[in-house]
């Protein structure tokens, strides 16, 4: 028998690139059984998290999974960072693992690094 | 119960290139991490790199940087491991590895494809 | 890179009597989720490795309870508390905390 608990499946140390200037979509799936929980979107910044109060975000329903969506219309260099999501439920926090988004600068998209690169020279990333 | 199918044994050139092959049955490799792990004869173990399926990002240990790319096709539910350049060096078993990128609640290896470099 | 020196090399152990297995890591494996990524592997022979113990102590399915892990930081320790003829094999700690992953150089163990 399925768990009735909310969970959040977001992979551990899970990492996107994306090019600042496009649109973005960070999903954050959501399993429940009847109530959708209060699901928010937070911002890292040392070992705080830091609540995105501001920010447009929207849910997608599918058959067995729900997904809580992050907008980024469009990508800013200072998206670069990692975010996680949370559910309120039965007055429990339920907080998912991070997730890394590493933001090419437009200027520098002639010049991209690959997916491999920034993988492994994650410097590349900051200029 | 999830289960990984390699590729069989590869005797290829000095400088030549090798694709390997891993399928999964069991899970939706989507859901998972992907990874490559070297062992010469008689020697320990070595971590190449991984991959998420989901979105295709990879991570390497520098040492194979340029030597290995891993790739993956969510349609057939498989991860690839390219080698280029090949050496004696890279003589070795490749084993492929799966684990739930969630929890971690599986972790499952295949049985190891042989690579023989040869001339 | 994170560098696992495992201790002793090889192991001989009497059918019946205890063993243990100690795995030092050169920094902390304590994540900012607050898990520690520390696994132990045996690899018998002629096999592929097979995953023991995940998250310092968890047990895999179907891996017998006299086996048990312990430890946090950069200090743990795989005891099997009664040897049987088919634990023998090289058991591997390796830790999934930071990248690259890595590998401890193994253990083997003999049935004396």
């Known amino acids: 028998k399925e768990s009735c608990d909310v969970q959040l499946y977001i992979k551990r140390q899970s990492e996107h690139s994306i090019l600042a200037g496009d649109p973005f979509e960070l999903e954050c799936p959501v399993k429940y059984c009847a109530n959708r929980p209060h699901v928010t979107w937070c911002k890292l910044n040392g070992t705080t998290c830091v609540k995105l109060e501001d920010r447009q975000t929207s849910w997608k329903e599918e058959k067995n999974i729900s997904f809580f969506i992050l907008h980024f219309e469009p990508v800013l260099p200072n998206d670069n960072g990692s975010y996680r999501c949370s559910a309120n439920f039965q007055s429990n926090l339920i907080e998912s693992h991070s997730t890394t988004l590493y933001v090419t600068d437009v200027k520098s998209a002639s010049e991209r690094p690959s997916k491999d690169e920034m993988a492994s020279r994650p410097w590349l990333l900051y200029r | 119960e999830v289960q990984l199918q390699q590729s069989g044994a590869e005797l290829v050139k000095p400088g030549a290139s090798v694709k390997l092959s891993c399928t999964a049955s069991?899970?939706?490799?989507?859901?998972?991490?992907m990874y490559w792990v070297k062992q010469r004869p008689e020697q320990g173990l070595e971590w190449i790199g991984r991959i998420d399926p989901a979105n295709g990002y990879t991570r390497y240990d520098p040492k194979f940087q340029g030597k290995a790319t891993i790739t993956a096709d969510t349609s057939s539910n498989t991860a690839h491991l390219q080698l280029s350049s090949l050496t004696s060096e890279d003589a070795a078993v490749y084993y492929c590895?799966?684990?739930?990128?969630?929890?971690?609640?599986?972790?499952?290896w295949g049985a190891g494809t042989t690579v023989t470099v040869s001339s | 890179d994170v560098v696992m020196t495992q201790a002793p090399l090889t192991l001989s152990v009497t059918i019946g009597q205890p063993a243990s297995i100690s795995c030092k890591s050169s920094q902390s494996l304590l994540d900012s989720d607050g898990k520690t990524y520390l696994n132990w592997l045996l690899q018998r022979p002629g096999q592929s490795p097979k995953r023991l113990i995940y998250?310092?102590?968890k047990l895999d399915s179907g891996v017998p309870d006299r086996f048990t892990g312990s430890g946090s930081g950069t200090d743990f320790t795989l005891k099997i508390n009664r040897v049987e003829a088919e634990d023998l094999g090289v058991y591997y700690c390796?830790?999934?905390?930071?990248?690259?992953?890595?590998f401890g150089g193994g253990t083997k163990l003999e049935i004396k």
């Open positions: 590895a799966v684990y739930d990128g969630y929890y971690e609640s599986f972790d499952v």
């Open positions: 069991g899970v939706n490799i989507k859901d998972t991490y």
């Open positions: 390796w830790q999934g905390t930071l990248f690259p992953r890595t």
């Open positions: 998250l310092v102590s």
